[in-house]
Interface confidence: low
């Protein structure tokens, strides 16, 4: 009921709490002498459902049968309307529509840790929309039963606050939950379990790792566990990996040797525990331990390549290059590279430690037989040295690979193909494909790239340090014992017409012909490998088509003669450059008049 209901009453039959789909009878009756003053027959009683009028009647009472009420709470209010006055509230009632509780399902109980308390959960089923109480019972040995109640409408969890002990780990316990509301009650199926079934150990703690003699091959993981733990599972992974390695161990007693860790790698370790082989559940994973494994001496050998450059009649420059070892080969932080240069006949050797670079340049005499050895060192030792005899890599013409071609292969890739050398192809021990950005000055500071290819291969895809619209000088070396032959070609992964033409910087007269000199197009404007230059000329003020001379591109060429100009005629000259994609715009225009005599 609501308000004080001084003027009358609202009664609800059969009950204020009804089953969904039931019918209720609502009666509103006025108390004696509470009707309209002087006009009791004029009493008009009105029944509202929330704010909506659903029935009215003249007299002292009103009966209304109501059906189809929704789940939840519905408010009914009875009011009295008299002539020439506002409606007066008489009384009201709330009706609660719901359902009996469904049988609670999937009752399960757990105890977190040997010292924890038993807590159970269940699925309530359909919402009753009514005040419902849940009672949880736990029956154990010796007819002992625990019981606890919660009164939350949405109750689906209860912690008993009691601790099961392992004195009789095989003893059975039975849990049951009962739900009760005004419309009925229902109990779950009983859930029977033992201590071992429901105790979920606490995750292991105090995890440590030790490396005996700072060696990755002698590694032990230590941890602390609750006393009854029988099983552990360990999972570990390199910190940069998503996949775990998993190990199951029995009766580990807080330690386990790990045999397959990689050196110089940060790992993440976690451990979980279980009390019994097939009963109960695993603990949560422990907090992660992160630890870096010790270094080991490098494995593998450096990939070393070199370049020779003639300085003068007695000296040559040797530039050595090598690639970093992979992380798995370096097995630690590489502190330095050791380069040993030796003259094989005289036995003189010089050794140098290189830090921070993967190249080294020195000048040696052109006489003698020279060899180098390069190794990588970390805190634990050095890799096996890579030994190379310094030879003239292109000396053996018969070993030169034939028909070398370089073609674009998708974005930033160049496919280099060749034919074996004429000389017995089976003599080739390996091919080396070398590439570097083409710089007209032949700059030795330009980074060198290379890859090795097996002797039966006749192609290689180069992709490392390849940029679009850049021309690369590509060499293919065939190596056989202490001999080498090479062929070279220019190639690019992507090209377009050059952005500008060559700049003519001088025109000079020489014996009735002219010599045109020009500046190279800046590398960034070449837009790939240049194939040709074109020199155009026409008589000044003439509308005729210009004549042209096409010159194959050569890196070092910066001048060209023309001998078909008429004396004492003023010509306009300009140049363009061509890649496979097309011709550049004009370079600058120059005028020239040949002074020589007519033929």
């Amino acid at each position: 009921k609501i308000d004080a209901c001084k003027r009358g009453d609202v009664t609800v039959k059969p009950s204020h709490v009804i089953l969904l789909g039931s019918t209720v009878n609502i009666t509103c009756s006025l108390k004696p002498r509470q009707g309209c003053f002087h006009y009791s027959r004029r009493n008009k009683l009105i029944l509202y459902k929330f704010d909506r009028r659903i029935n009215f009647h003249h007299g002292h009472s009103l009966n209304s049968q109501v059906t189809g009420l929704p789940l939840g709470t519905t408010l009914f209010v009875c009011k009295l309307a008299c002539i020439n006055s506002d409606e007066i509230q008489i009384c009201g009632a709330e009706i609660f529509v719901g359902v009996a509780p469904e049988q609670p399902q999937n009752l399960s109980c757990i105890q977190k840790g040997e010292q924890g308390t038993v807590a159970c959960t269940w699925e309530r089923g359909r919402d009753t929309h009514l005040y419902t109480e849940y009672t949880l019972q736990l029956s154990g040995p010796k007819n002992l039963t625990w019981q606890k109640q919660c009164k939350d409408i949405y109750c689906d969890y209860l912690d008993f606050g009691i601790n099961l002990t392992p004195e009789s780990p095989e003893s059975n316990f039975t849990a049951k939950v009962t739900a009760v509301n005004s419309l009925g009650s229902s109990s779950s199926l009983p859930s029977t379990f033992t201590f071992l079934d429901i105790v979920r150990p606490l995750p292991p703690w105090d995890i440590r790792i030790k490396f005996q003699k700072a060696s990755v091959s002698r590694c032990t993981l230590y941890w602390r566990d609750e006393g009854l733990v029988l099983l552990n599972r360990l999972r570990y992974r390199p910190s940069n990996s998503r996949l775990w390695n998993m190990v199951n161990v029995t009766k580990a007693k807080g330690r386990h040797d790990l045999l397959d860790l990689k050196p110089f790698t940060e790992y993440e370790f976690q451990i979980s525990s279980k009390l019994h082989l097939y009963k109960g559940s695993w603990s949560d994973w422990s907090e992660s331990l992160r630890a870096q494994t010790p270094e080991e001496e490098p494995t593998g050998m450096l990939d070393v390549w070199y370049m020779k450059r003639h300085i003068d009649y007695s000296r040559q420059q040797i530039s050595l290059f090598w690639k970093n070892l992979s992380v798995s080969e370096a097995r630690g932080k590489i502190l330095h590279y050791q380069v040993t240069l030796q003259e094989l006949t005289g036995g003189k050797a010089m050794t140098q430690n290189i830090t921070g670079h993967t190249s080294w340049t020195t000048v040696i005499p052109r006489t003698g037989n020279w060899a180098v050895a390069v190794s990588a060192a970390n805190s634990k030792g050095s890799s096996l040295p890579t030994r190379i005899n310094i030879m003239n890599l292109c000396e053996a013409g018969l070993l030169a690979p034939r028909q070398v071609s370089a073609n674009s292969e998708g974005m930033d890739n160049i496919l280099v193909t060749w034919q074996p050398p004429r000389k017995d192809p089976s003599a080739v021990q390996e091919y080396v494909v070398e590439w570097r950005e083409l710089h007209p000055g032949g700059d030795t500071q330009v980074p060198l790239n290379w890859l090795r290819s097996r002797p039966y291969n006749v192609s290689a895809l180069i992709s490392e340090n390849i940029k679009s619209y850049i021309c690369y000088e590509i060499r293919v070396y065939a190596l056989s014992g202490d001999q080498g032959g090479c062929s070279s070609i220019l190639g690019n992964s992507k090209h377009k017409a050059p952005l500008s033409g060559p700049h003519i910087n001088a025109i000079t007269e020489e014996k009735g012909s002219i010599l045109i000199s020009w500046n190279s197009i800046p590398v960034q404007e070449q837009m790939g490998c240049l194939l040709h230059y074109r020199i155009y000329w026409k008589e000044r003020d003439s509308n005729s088509q210009p004549q042209l001379c096409e010159i194959p591109y050569r890196v070092s060429q910066n001048s060209h003669p023309i001998n078909s100009l008429q004396p004492r005629v003023t010509y306009v000259l300009w140049m363009t450059a061509l890649t496979a994609a097309g011709e550049s715009s004009h370079g600058n225009e120059r005028e020239f008049c040949l002074q020589g005599k007519a033929n």
């Epitope: 999937n106 959960t121 699925e123 689906d156 999972r235 992974r237 998503r242 996949l243 775990w244 998993m246 949560d284 994973w285």
Partner: nanobody, 125 residues
Amino acid sequence: QVQLVESGGGLVQTGASLRLSCAASGRTFGRYEMAWFRQAPGKEREFVAHISSSGLTTTYADSVKGRFTISRGNALNTVYLQMNSLKPEDTAVYYCAANVDGSAWSTLGAGMDYWGKGTLVTISS
């Protein structure tokens, strides 16, 4: 314990469609990663499809990409596998699996905590 019950299998002809359902018990279904695996007679169990707990991320085996679709109805505690353009080589027992603790799982099934008993799908040519 999470219990997984598969249904929807049967015998159909090449090119037909089937929809498998996997009903999962447990209130926290919405936290499980769910997956479908299959095992053809005399062969190893193989991964088919996986869906994250949120349903945002799905992964498929190459052999079923474009033909099968995994989805989930957390409200119904169900994961589905819609299989179209079925081929004879799709014949297998299909298993539903749940990864409850979010650990790494492999396409061989490592890391999956719970498995259904399977439902047989037969594709006749």
